[in-house]
Every structure is written in C-alpha cells, then in structure tokens.
C-alpha cells in the first residue's frame, strides 16, 4: 500500500477471477478508481472499476475470461494497482506484486443436495465450483449444521482433511429441521483463505417410527 491508512487485498479464485477490496481512510466517495492488473508473462491487461461497499471500502472483480478457463498459473506474478482520478490525472493509491496461487480463495461450494436421510442421519453431497485442476485432490472442507434454537456461530465445525465432496451427519434428532453449509480451501498458498460458506441446504430428518424406541 502507498500509505499506512490504505489496505489493498486481493484473492484469486484459481481460474479466471481476482477479487479485490481496497480500504482507505478519508478517501473521497465520488472519486472514480480502478484496479489495474498487469501480468508479468501474459499479453493481456485487465481493469475493473472499484465500487463502494462501505464508507471507506471499495471492491471489484477482475474477470480474466470464461469462468472455467485457467488464466493464471503458479509461476505468474500480476502487478495490481489501485488508480484514482485526480482531475485529469490518475494517481496510484496502492500497488502489490500479486502471486495468484499464494492468495487463493475459491468460490463457495454449489449443488448441495440430500443424498439420503433417515431419523438420525443425513448424507449430503456438494460440488466445487471453478476450482483449478492444478489442485488435484489437495483440498480440504469445513462443514457446519444449524440446529433448532442455535446460531451458525454456535455450530461446531466439522473438518474434512481431504477432497471429499460428501458427508454423513449422525446423531441427529428425528423429525427436526436442520440447515447445512460447507466451505472449501486449497492446501496451497501462504495467504490462502477459506471460500465463502455455501448457500444453506435445509433438510428434515424422518420422524421416528411409532411405538419404537429412539
């Protein structure tokens, strides 16, 4: 960053998107600002216009191509700049040499579905979205289940230390409504972080059979 009150953070989704957030104390809300991407070994440049997300924070997505195209590799370095208009000139407000595969944040898992549900158990599957083939199986997942009367923050985290796109939830209460979320993270990358949580999947366990012990 250019000065101590500016923060410029970007993540690569491993395929064709770099999402950036720029925070700047005292920055002008009306100023037009762009993120400019200049790869060291590619023939393209890319810009996106920063849009306000809060009083002193702006965000945009550098869309590098079709969603599933592999636009960057582990050896790429992309110079990312925040440029803001000052009159007829553009001033560099922040700059970083961005290593995409050291700053990964994948898309949230998609296509959550109940494979099988019983009174006390539920088998759920999901898919990863726009994840690079470079990872092979080097991914991990976290999952959480929302029980009645609790919040997501109270839900215990279940960790899957391998590329396993399903889970069998056990010790559930019969005839009870639950919600389930999952997120994914590559093992690679010093500054890599978890994906956003998936959209919640609602499901209900089956009622206990009448006259039987539960």
């Amino acid at each position: 960053a250019v000065n101590g009150t500016s923060q410029f953070t970007c993540f690569y989704n491993s395929r064709a998107n770099i999402s950036c957030v720029w925070s700047q104390d005292g920055a002008l809300q009306d100023t037009s600002c762009q993120v400019h991407a200049w790869p060291d070994r590619r023939r393209w440049n890319q810009t996106c216009e920063l849009l306000p997300v809060s009083q002193a924070s702006w965000a945009c997505n550098l869309i590098l191509g079709a969603p599933d195209s592999q636009k960057l590799t582990t050896v790429d370095i992309v110079t990312l700049r925040v440029l803001c208009r000052e009159g007829v000139r553009w001033r560099v407000m922040a700059i970083q040499d961005f290593k995409p595969f050291e700053n990964l944040r994948l898309m949230a898992p998609i296509s959550l579905q109940v494979v099988h549900v019983e009174t006390h158990r539920c088998n759920i599957s999901w898919e990863i979205s726009q994840a690079s083939h470079y990872f092979e199986r080097h991914l991990e997942f976290e999952a959480r289940t929302l029980s009645p009367g609790h919040t997501w923050e109270e839900a215990p985290l279940l960790t899957l230390k391998q590329k396993q796109e399903w889970i069998c939830l056990e010790t559930l209460t019969p005839d009870t409504q639950y919600e389930f979320q999952v997120r994914v993270k590559p093992l690679q990358g010093e500054f890599t972080t978890w994906s956003p949580w998936s959209q919640p999947l609602a499901f209900r366990t089956k009622p206990a059979a009448l006259g039987k012990d539960t």
Epitope: S32, H36, N45, Q46, T47, E49, L64, G65, L83, W90
Partner: nanobody, 123 residues
Framework: EVQLVESGGGLVQAGGSLRLSCVVS????????MAWFRQAPGKEREFVAA????????EYVDSVKGRFTVSRDNAKNTVYLQMNNLEPEDTAVYYC????????????????WGQGTQVTVSS
Amino acid sequence: EVQLVESGGGLVQAGGSLRLSCVVSGDVFVRYTMAWFRQAPGKEREFVAAVTDSGRTTEYVDSVKGRFTVSRDNAKNTVYLQMNNLEPEDTAVYYCAANTDYFQIRSVDNNAWGQGTQVTVSS
C-alpha cells in the same frame, strides 16, 4: 475472440436523435470497458465516449458532452450511444470498441472493433 456488432445508424435531420447499439459476443462482456469512436470522411478515427465495466463511470469528448449519453446493459451484453441534438458535424461512421484495459480504451491500436454503422445528419 470477442465480436462486436453495431446497429441503429441512419439519416436524420439536424436537431434529431438516434440511438446506436452494440452487441458483444464471444467473451465475458463485463471484462470490457466499452467505447464509441467515429470516423468522418477523410479524417482519422476519433474517440467519442466510453463506459467502464460496471457502467458507473462515463467519459466523453468535449464536442458531444451534454448531447450524447453512453450506457451499457450487462445483462444484454450491449452498449448504447444515445445521440440527441445531432449536428451535421456528427456525420461519420460510428464504431463500437472494446478493451479489457480501461487505460487503453482511447487508443485506436489495441481495441477490438465492430464493423461500424453510418450516421448522416442533414442540415
């Protein structure tokens, strides 16, 4: 490879209006800053207007400010140029241009181009 197709040109009297459209295909539309250029007979192609990927920011050459409005519909992969209070000096072939780099859009060299649409303003 990105393809651009303009439409909406025609013959109009001075003081009239036209709306040009440019449909983009072959790539992700929101990657691109979009612009309109024009080329009058015997003259070089000149920048007219541009709109950023988000559509929030627009730019115009001084001679069209207050008369022309550039906009985009990212859901329809289309950029528009609304031209009001047209003058005979606006007569030209109007070209749609696309560039992934906002800072290169005014340059004629590195843009993707449409085939152009003729606008003729009679006095």
